[in-house]
């Protein structure tokens, strides 16, 4: 039974997107009063694992020496103190890449684009898939995806971007997946470098002009709403 204890923090190192066969460590950080840590995996018998705290007792380590599809999924952790069990942590989604062959990522009409114009990133898989994800390196919200609404299998997904601005420039990769597990992704596509030239930009300085530090919906190809009735793909914001 969840008590009034504050929830612990759950994270993965080196990250939550792990290639098949690589090692990953899941950390759960509670309080100095913690006596035991428990890790639960969604749709698996609880507890998935238990660990004694590491000194000074405020965290525990859960090791996965070699990433496989069995480890992909959603995790939460708890800690037990003398007064009972804590609230659950926020969920950690551990994703495995390398489950399917890599898709191809291209830019239409070209990866060289002028500010103020549009570009469409096209992710194509050899076999039909129902989820396509686009990742921009160093973006604040790197995961965007198109998912089939009715199990319709697709060989490709289009990610439209407009108007293109300087913050769209950078390196993109895409993944494909099957809807039965959102946590199993293909190998990443080869990187695509999008280069934005600024010939359409207003040359006058603006008093509010600043460097954009967050890559958000405007400089991502998707928005958190909407659907694609003709292709059967639905947009999701991750």
């Amino acid at each position: 039974q969840a008590g009034p204890l504050p929830k612990p923090t759950l994270w993965a190192e080196p990250g939550s997107v792990i290639s098949w066969g690589n090692s990953v460590t899941i950390w759960c950080q509670g309080t100095l009063e913690a006596r035991e840590y428990r890790l639960d995996k969604e749709e698996s018998p609880a507890p998935w694992d238990r660990q004694n705290p590491l000194e000074p007792k405020n965290k525990a380590r859960f090791s996965i020496p070699s990433m496989t599809e069995d480890y992909a999924g959603r995790y939460r952790c708890y800690y037990r103190s003398p007064v009972g069990w804590s609230q659950p942590s926020d969920p950690l989604e551990l994703v495995m890449t390398g489950a399917y062959s890599k898709p191809t990522l291209s830019a239409l009409p070209s990866p060289l684009v002028t500010s103020g114009k549009s570009v469409t990133l096209l992710c194509q898989s050899r076999s039909p898939m129902d989820t396509f994800l686009l990742i921009k390196e160093r973006a604040a919200h790197p995961l965007l995806h198109l998912r089939s609404e009715h199990g319709a299998q697709q060989h490709q997904a289009e990610f439209p971007m407009s108007p293109v601005t300087s913050v769209h420039g950078g390196t993109y990769r895409c993944f494909s997946s099957h809807g039965f597990s959102h946590y199993l992704l293909s190998h990443p596509s080869d990187p695509l470098e999008l280069i934005v030239s600024g010939s359409l930009e207003d040359p006058r300085p603006s008093p509010t002009r600043s460097v954009s530090t967050a890559a958000g919906p405007e400089d991502q190809p998707l928005m958190p709403t909407g659907s694609v009735p003709h292709s059967g793909l639905r947009r999701h914001w991750e």
Epitope: L108, G116, K117, P160, G216, E218, L222
Partner: antibody, heavy 118, light 107 residues
Framework: EVQLVESGGGLVQPGGSRKLSCAAS????????VHWVRQAPEKGLEWVAY????????HYADTVKGRFTISRDIPKNTLFLQMTSLRSEDTAMYYC???????????WGQGTSVTVSS | DIQMTQSTSSLSASLGDRVSISCRAS??????LNWYQQKPDGAVKLLIY???RLHSGVPSRFSGSGSGTDYSLTISNLDQEDIATYFC?????????FGGGTKLELK
């Protein structure tokens, strides 16, 4: 719920100035580009200006270039349109609209009316 | 600039009808075509973006199609609340431009 509320409209003399504001709420203002669009009485919609999320990209319609300035105050979640050297043909309902990032404007304000007349 | 043309400025239809509104661009806009609804009170709403993608909360009776320079909006089962003016807009290149609008009226 996404909300955009324009203000600052009114009657202005030809050659005069006016500053419109658009207060945004219900979303993270700092990560969306925003547009101004206008509609003259009994006419269609006309795109006026765009400012990107970080204000580092700005575009204007040729009809307002050099006279209008779009800007934003991110801490205050507010978009502005400074209009100078106003002409009778600038008489319109002015709307602010959020840029979807996909070439569309996905949420619009209710508009504020500007009348340029002597 | 890209010119957008809605050849029909007004259209009369009955409740329950299937209605199509067309829009033509002066050059290929690569599917960056959006449809908006403007009610008599002036309120504007996005219906369809990127030719055929339904915006959040928009009834499924609205659909869009087209490619290149020719696009259309279809309302499959006209409802009383659909009586409005419909505008197409290209989002391919700034300056973004709108069609002149098609006013939908009841017969």
């Amino acid at each position: 719920e996404v909300q955009l509320v324009e203000s600052g409209g009114g009657l202005v003399q030809p050659g005069g100035s006016r500053k419109l504001s658009c207060a945004a709420s219900g979303f993270t203002f700092s990560v969306f580009g925003v547009h101004w669009v206008r509609q003259a009485p009994e006419k269609g919609l006309e795109w006026v200006a765009y400012i990107s999320s970080g204000s580092n990209t700005i575009h204007y319609a040729d009809t307002v270039k050099g006279r209008f300035t779009i800007s934003r105050d991110i801490p205050k979640n507010t978009l502005f349109l400074q209009m100078t050297s106003l002409r009778s043909e600038d008489t319109a309902m002015y709307y602010c609209a959020r840029s979807s990032g996909t070439g569309a404007m996905d949420y619009w304000g209710q508009g504020t009316s500007v009348t340029v007349s002597s | 600039d890209i010119q957008m043309t809605q050849s029909t400025s007004s259209l009369s239809a009955s409740l329950g009808d299937r209605v199509s509104i067309s829009c033509r661009a002066s050059q290929d806009i690569s599917n960056y075509l959006n449809w908006y609804q403007q009610k008599p009170d002036g309120a504007v709403k996005l219906l369809i973006y990127y030719t055929s993608r339904l915006h959040s909360g928009v009834p499924s009776r609205f659909s869009g199609s087209g490619s290149g320079t020719d696009y259309s909006l279809t309302i499959s089962n006209l409802d009383q609340e659909d009586i409005a003016t419909y505008f197409c807009q290209q989002g391919n290149t700034l300056p973004w431009t709108f069609g002149g609008g098609t006013k939908l009226e009841l017969k």
